[in-house]
């Protein structure tokens, strides 16, 4: 109620002889500041005097503090809030009640605090969780209801008298609510800790023993087992006997059931602590353990690896990789169940031993076609040699080998023949599926690997084929060697280099571009008449009569070829000039007379000149001289001259006779 002073402090404080007491304390006076404070030991109220009697351990007044007990007791408080006290050292006879007599200007109060001082340091108290299970972390707590600033202490944990490695966390409390020192230890107990003694030891600052508390650990755990085997190395041969014994070295609580496991699977009808295996087979090889259960759970022994030894079983071969491409690498693995593992291997290729290969793996760095076939192996260990298994097939794939182009025709081949070629090869894996031909042409392939060339050209020189599976292999080109008649026959003038003039020396050459076979004959002809059989036709002195159309022929064993007709042109000056007269060489006066200058010339006459009987040139320059009307005085001998680019020619005299007409004669 409102008439009380309000105090907060621990109800009882604990200490021991020679230690100290620190009393945390707070208060609130009813009015004003504290004016007087007396600390009594076991105070008793005297009704007669209305005062408290008892030993005064500390006293303070308005006048100041009165020394008491050589300052063993200290008031560490103040006049309105703090009432903390310290007694150092504390003695056995300090046990009892401490009375804090507080007076303010108008109010008084007696606050009681219990002090329990023992003769010797009292033990701490270990607190354990209700159940401890192996491998589950627990916190062990050691609590001591003591703490004092003037008297440092430490709490140490021991397991079977040996300091524990785990780090403990120590905490102290010196508050108005509680005074204690506490050590907490986090700890994962193992089954082997069961029944072991844990101690919390109280020590002074120098590590001197003051007191302790001990507890015995009750660690719940699955059964702990030991397995024993005969023979001890657990290595036996087929037909031998094996005994395994399971021993429980610890179980908390007691075990309830027993079973045996092989490779993690429970063995039926095996529920005793002894497992007898009679006449073992290789299938009984494996990892054995016993399992014993209690309320915590099942416990398993360590595994015993039972090895039933036997000679290698028939082997199998694994190939990486088949089919293999020629030139690639291949690895073979010999697989054979055996115990102990095989120490030696013998490898076979198509039944023949592969020299130098005695390991489990064989590596062929570059596969060749002949490496194809069956690979088998035999494994060997200390107990014997296995049998050769069925083996594995290595398929070696490679491009077609030794490809050739073969001409099926009888030789020689002539231009225009039908040629048949075949593409042959020695071997191929996989099989050849198609063929290619070079050069490409509009040729027919009547069947796979056969090429038919209809009407073969003279210029079909070489043909090559390829046989193809996954790859194409080309044959060397084969020469068709097509035979044909001479080609491109033509006449070529060798000399003279310029135009041919009558009298020149002239040579004509019969040319051709090619011929197969090379041996040829030549023929020259003019107007169907054979002139010569050489490649050249020569004229020592050409005459206009030699002009005309010439052809040459070239023939070989296949046929003959003619050139185009070649015109030989001979240039010459006008010749064979004569004057012809029309209507005749006798003409009546008054009529018309035409004189024509006829000639033979190449090129034709370009210019004519007329002359009379006096060799006088007449003013006429065309081929014809027309006299109209003709007069008697025109009578006489005439001649003409013709000119071309080569030269001139003149005609002989031709006489024109003009006679009088009857009229003239009549007039006369």
């Amino acid at each position: 109620d409102s008439s009380k002073w309000v105090f907060e402090h621990p109800e009882t404080l604990y200490a021991w002889e020679g230690a100290c007491v620190w009393i945390p304390c707070t208060y609130r006076a009813l009015d004003g500041d504290l004016e007087s404070f007396i600390l009594f030991h076991n105070p008793e109220y005297n009704k007669n005097t209305s005062k408290f009697d008892g030993t005064r351990l500390y006293e303070s007044t308005k006048d100041g503090k009165v020394p008491s007990e050589q300052k063993r007791v200290q008031f560490l408080g103040d006049k309105n809030k703090n009432c903390t006290l310290s007694i150092h050292p504390v003695h056995l006879n300090d046990s009892g009640q401490l009375g804090l007599r507080m007076e303010s200007k108008t109010e008084k109060w007696m606050e009681r605090i219990h002090l329990n001082v023992s003769e010797r340091p009292f033990p701490p108290h270990i607190q354990l969780p209700p159940e401890i299970q192996e491998s589950q972390e627990v916190t062990l707590t050691c609590l001591l209801n003591f703490s004092c600033y003037g008297y440092p202490i430490q709490l140490q944990w021991l397991l079977e008298g040996v300091p524990m490695r785990q780090a403990a966390v120590t905490s102290t409390s010196l508050t108005i609510k509680s005074v204690f020192t506490r050590s907490e230890l986090k700890f994962s107990p193992q089954w082997s800790h069961h029944g072991k003694i844990v101690t919390c030891q109280l020590q002074d600052a120098d590590g001197k023993f003051l007191s302790n508390d001990t507890v015995q650990l009750n660690v719940k755990h699955t059964p702990k087992l030991e397995i024993k085997v005969t023979p001890s190395d657990a290595i036996v041969r087929e037909g031998d006997s094996v005994t395994m014994t399971c021993e429980v070295s610890s179980s908390n609580p007691e075990y309830t059931t027993v079973s045996w496991l092989k490779d993690g699977t429970s063995l039926k009808k095996q529920n005793t602590f002894t497992l007898n295996l009679r006449e073992v087979t290789k299938d009984q090889s494996g990892k054995y353990c016993c399992q014993v259960s209690n309320d915590v759970g099942p416990g398993r022994s360590e595994e015993v690896f039972l090895q039933v030894q036997y000679a290698p079983e028939p082997s199998t071969v694994q190939i990486l990789h088949s089919p293999a491409v020629e030139g690639s690498q291949v690895e073979f693995l010999c697989m054979s169940l055996a115990n102990p593992l095989p120490t030696n291997y013998t490898w076979y290729h198509n039944g023949k031993e592969m020299q130098g290969r005695t390991e489990e793996k064989v590596h062929i760095p570059k596969i060749l076609p002949w490496h194809a076939g069956t690979y088998s192996c035999v494994a060997e260990n200390i107990l014997g040699t296995g049998q050769r298994g069925p083996g594995a097939e290595l398929d070696v794939q490679y491009p077609p080998k030794k490809v050739t182009t073969v001409i099926q025709n009888p030789m020689p081949i002539r231009e225009g023949d039908t040629v048949t070629l075949s593409c042959n090869y020695n071997s191929s894996n996989p099989s050849v599926t198609r063929y290619e031909w070079k050069p490409h042409g509009a040729w027919e392939e009547p069947s796979l690997g056969v090429l038919k060339i209809q009407n073969v050209g003279w210029d079909n020189t070489t043909i090559a084929c390829a046989a193809c599976n996954s790859w194409c292999s080309w044959a060397s080109p084969v020469a068709l060697n097509v035979q044909y008649a001479p080609r491109d026959v033509r006449v070529r003038k060798i000399k003279p280099l310029s135009e041919i003039h009558s009298g020149n020396s002239v040579s004509l050459q019969c040319d051709f571009s090619s011929s197969h076979p090379k041996e040829v004959q030549f023929f020259w002809e003019k107007n169907g008449r054979l002139l010569g059989k050489e490649s050249q036709l020569n004229f020592d002195s050409i005459s206009p009569e030699d002009a005309g159309s010439y052809s040459c022929w070239v023939n070989n064993s296949i046929g003959q070829t003619a050139s185009k007709a070649w015109t030989l042109e001979v240039l010459y000056a006008p010749r064979r000039l004569r004057v012809s007269m029309s209507p005749g060489d006798q003409v009546m006066e008054g009529k018309s007379a035409t004189l024509t200058c006829e000639s033979d010339a190449n090129p034709p006459v370009s210019h004519y000149t007329w002359f009379d009987w006096n060799n006088q040139s007449l003013p006429y320059h065309s081929q014809k001289l027309r006299l109209e009307p003709v007069k008697v005085q025109h009578s006489g001998a005439y001649w003409c001259q013709g000119t071309n680019s080569v030269g001139k020619g003149r005609s002989p005299l031709s006489t024109l006779t003009v006679y009088y007409s009857p009229e003239t004669i009549g007039r006369r």
């Epitope: 020299q355 130098g356 290969r357 390991e359 060749l368």
Partner: antibody, heavy 122, light 107 residues
């Protein structure tokens, strides 16, 4: 029958490049499974494998000398050439070429040349 | 690289003696081991290939055995013409390597 013959300079100077030719007969290096190798032997010392070339023109070299060696073949001439750069007096040795039988691998050296002594002078 | 170690490095024996030379590989080489004989000033000659196969033309007194890492060359009855240096060679992996050689002489 199979024969191999080494040819090259008897004397080379330090830092020069050595070129050796192995001329062989009785087999073709274009035939699958045929290989030629070079081996050397310093005076009074052990044989040391140098290089190998096979029918496929695959080449293999000694780990310690691979930066200095080049092996090549001329199938038409039935020759294998080895060049070795940066010659040093420690390279003085008899140089052999040998045919390798490739059966299931580069298995053994069945024919050897008579060897050619190369002296490296400083 | 695979190291090949021969022992002994030299040995002396009498005509008719049984002679054994050992070759040890630094790692397993299956049976890909060959033995060569080299006489002074001559090229090596193949005696045994694939650890135990006798090369044609080689006298039958020469034999080879072993696999994995330990190999042996045996001359059953030493003859005067057998005086030479013998060396082993592995072809299991490249680089191909030779042993340092064993010099055999007559007592």
């Amino acid at each position: 029958q199979v024969t191999l013959r080494e040819s090259g300079p008897a004397l080379v100077k330090t830092t020069q490049t050595l070129t050796l030719t192995c001329t062989f007969s009785g087999f073709s290096l274009s035939t699958s499974g045929m290989c030629v190798s070079w081996i050397r032997q310093p005076p009074g010392k052990a044989l040391e494998w140098l290089a190998l070339i096979d029918w496929d023109d695959d080449k293999y070299y000694s780990t310690s000398l691979k930066t200095r060696l080049t092996i090549s073949k001329d199938t038409s001439k039935s020759q294998v050439v080895l060049t070795m750069t940066s010659m040093d007096p420690v390279d003085t040795a008899t140089y052999y070429c040998a045919r390798i039988r490739y059966i299931y691998g580069y298995d053994y050296f069945d024919y050897w040349g008579q060897g050619t002594l190369v002296t490296v002078s400083s | 690289d695979i190291q090949m170690t021969q022992s002994p490095s030299s040995l002396s024996a009498s005509v008719g003696d049984r002679v054994t030379i050992t070759c040890r590989a630094s790692q397993r080489i299956s049976s890909q081991l060959n033995w060569y004989q080299q006489k002074p000033g001559k090229a090596p000659k193949l005696l045994i290939y694939a650890a135990s196969s006798l090369q044609s033309g080689v006298p039958s007194r020469f034999s080879g055995s072993g696999s994995g890492t330990e190999f042996t060359l045996t001359i059953s009855s030493l003859q005067p013409e057998d005086i030479a240096t013998y060396c082993c060679q592995q072809t299991y992996s490249k680089p191909i390597t030779f042993g340092q050689g064993t010099r055999l002489e007559i007592k």
